[in-house]
Amino acid sequence: VPRWRQQWSGPGTTKRFPETVLARCVKYTEIHPEMRHVDCQSVWDAFKGAFISKHPCNITEEDYQPLMKLGTQTVPCNKILLWSRIKDLAHQFTQVQRDMFTLEDTLLGYLADDLTWCGEFNTSKINYQSCPDWRKDCSNNPVSVFWKTVSRRFAEAACDVVHVMLNGSRSKIFDKNSTFGSVEVHNLQPEKVQTLEAWVIHGGREDSRDLCQDPTIKELESIISKRNIQFSCKNIYRPDKFLQCVKNPEDSSCTSEI
C-alpha cells in the first residue's frame, strides 16, 4: 500500500529556509558584538533538531530548549516593546529608537521572522509543500510553538515600564487570542513590571476618537490590573508624525499631541 505524506492546510516551509536561518544568524552576530560568540552552525543544528523527524502537530516547548539555550541574550529589561497586529510600525520604531527592542530585534526573533517551517515524523526531510495551519490543523506546530516559547521568555524578561503597540484600525484592538493577548500579557512578572503602557496606533487621518476607551482596551486594563501591574494608554493619532518625531524630537511640531 503506498504511503502518502500528510497534507496540511498551511503553506510549506519557506524556500531556502536552512540557508536563510544560517545567513541571518551570521549577519546578526556580525552586527551585534555581544552575540559574536554564537556558533551559527550549532544554532542551525539546534533549530533543525527542534522539528526534524518529529510529527509537526506534536511539537513542545522542550523541543526548542537547546535552541533557546544557544540564543540566550540579555536585552535591557526596561526597553522592551511588545506589539500586536502592527509589526511593521513597531520595527520601524525600534530601527529609529535603537535603545528599544522588539522580539524580532533579538537573535531568535530575527532568525525566524516571517518564516514558516515544519518536518515530517520519522524522516530527516523538511516539508516544503505544506505545514500545519494553527486553526485548521493543530496549534502545537513548529512555528506556533516557537513563537509561544520565545514570546513567553521575552515577556518574562521585561521590567519597569513595558510598552505595547496596538493596531487601532482593527475591530479588536486588543485581541485575547493574539500572541500578545494569550502569551505575553500573562507572562509579564508583577514583581518586576511596574506599568504596561499601550500605544494605540490610529489608521485614519481624520480619526480623532479616543481609542483608549475602546472596550477591548478596557478588557486589557482589567487583565493587567488584576495582575497587580499598572496600566496606561496613549493614542498615536499620526503614526507618520510619531516616527518623524522619534527621529527628530527637537522639531517644533513635535511638542503637540501626535
Epitope: R3, R16, Y128
Partner: antibody, heavy 122, light 110 residues
Framework: QVQLQQSGPGLVKPSQTLSLTCVIS??????????WNWIRQSPSRGLEWLGR?????????DYAVSVESRIIVNPDTSKNQFSLQLNSVTPEDTAVYYC????????????WGQGTMVTVSS | FMLTQPHSVSESPGKTVTIPCTRS????????VQWYQQRPDSSPIIVIY?????PSGVPDRFSGSIDSSSNSASLTISGLKTEDEAAYYC??????????FGGGTKLTVL
C-alpha cells in the same frame, strides 16, 4: 480519474510568445493540495521543469531560474485549466512541452498531459 | 545542483539492474527522490516517489533506495522483462522547491 489535455500551436516564430493550455478533468486547478506544472523535454536538455501554479489561500507561482524572466503560468478557474506563456522564444526553446500534476502528498508528478511538440522556427 | 545518471545500461531478461543517480551538491537524504519511466513517444510515468515508495499499479520488482555515503539514489528493477525497456529519469528538488531531473538512463533489455 485525473486527466490533463494539452492544446496549443506546434510552430512558433523566434522572438514571439509560446502559449499552451492544459485542461484539467477529475481535479480542480484551485485544489488546496495539488500544484500544476509545466515541463519540457528536448534531446539537448532532457527533462526540464519550468514552473508551477498552485492555490493555498491565494495563488502562488514558482519558476525555474533558467526561464524566470520569460515565463508566466496562469490558472483559469472558470475553465478549470492553466496555461504556459513563454516570451521571446529562440530555437533553443524547441521541445516537447508537458503539463503535469504534483498531487501535494509527494514531491513528484503523478499525472501528465500527452505532450505538445513545439518547434521554434521562422 | 545536478543529478547525474549513466547514459545507458543493459541487462538480460530475468536479471536485476540498478540505475544510479548522483546528486552534485546538497545532501541526497535531505530531499526526496522520484523515478519516472518513459517509453518512446509516451509521457513519463512515476514508478517511485519519496525515495522508495511505489504508487499502486507499479510492480514490486521496482524499488528505490538512497546511499548517503555516495550521495546518490538508485532505482533497482529485478526480474527484468522486455516491457521494462525504456528511459528512466530521477528527479529531486532543493530548498527553493525547484525541481531538477537527471539526464535519463536508457535501459535495454537484451
Amino acid at each position: 480519474q485525473v486527466q490533463l489535455q494539452q492544446s496549443g500551436p506546434g510552430l512558433v516564430k523566434p522572438s514571439q510568445t509560446l502559449s499552451l493550455t492544459c485542461v484539467i478533468s477529475g481535479d480542480s486547478v484551485s485544489s488546496n493540495s495539488a500544484a500544476w506544472n509545466w515541463i519540457r523535454q528536448s534531446p539537448s536538455r532532457g527533462l526540464e521543469w519550468l514552473g508551477r501554479t498552485y492555490y493555498r489561500s491565494k495563488w502562488h507561482n514558482d519558476y525555474a531560474v533558467s526561464v524566470e524572466s520569460r515565463i508566466i503560468v496562469n490558472p483559469d478557474t472558470s475553465k478549470n485549466q492553466f496555461s504556459l506563456q513563454l516570451n521571446s522564444v529562440t530555437p533553443e526553446d524547441t521541445a516537447v512541452y508537458y503539463c503535469a500534476r504534483d498531487p501535494g502528498y509527494f514531491y513528484g508528478l503523478d499525472v501528465w498531459g500527452q505532450g505538445t511538440m513545439v518547434t521554434v522556427s521562422s | 545542483f545536478m543529478l547525474t545518471q549513466p547514459h545507458s545500461v543493459s541487462e538480460s531478461p530475468g536479471k536485476t539492474v540498478t540505475i544510479p543517480c548522483t546528486r552534485s551538491s546538497g545532501t541526497i537524504a535531505d530531499y526526496y527522490v522520484q523515478w519516472y519511466q518513459q517509453r518512446p513517444d509516451s509521457s513519463p510515468i512515476i514508478v517511485i516517489y519519496d525515495d522508495n515508495q511505489r504508487p499502486s499499479g507499479v510492480p514490486d520488482r521496482f524499488s528505490g533506495s538512497i546511499d548517503s555515503s555516495s550521495n546518490s539514489a538508485s532505482l533497482t528493477i529485478s526480474g527484468l522483462k522486455t516491457e521494462d525497456e525504456a528511459a528512466y529519469y530521477c528527479q529531486s528538488y532543493d530548498s527553493t522547491n525547484h525541481w531538477v531531473f537527471g539526464g535519463g538512463t536508457k535501459l535495454t533489455v537484451l
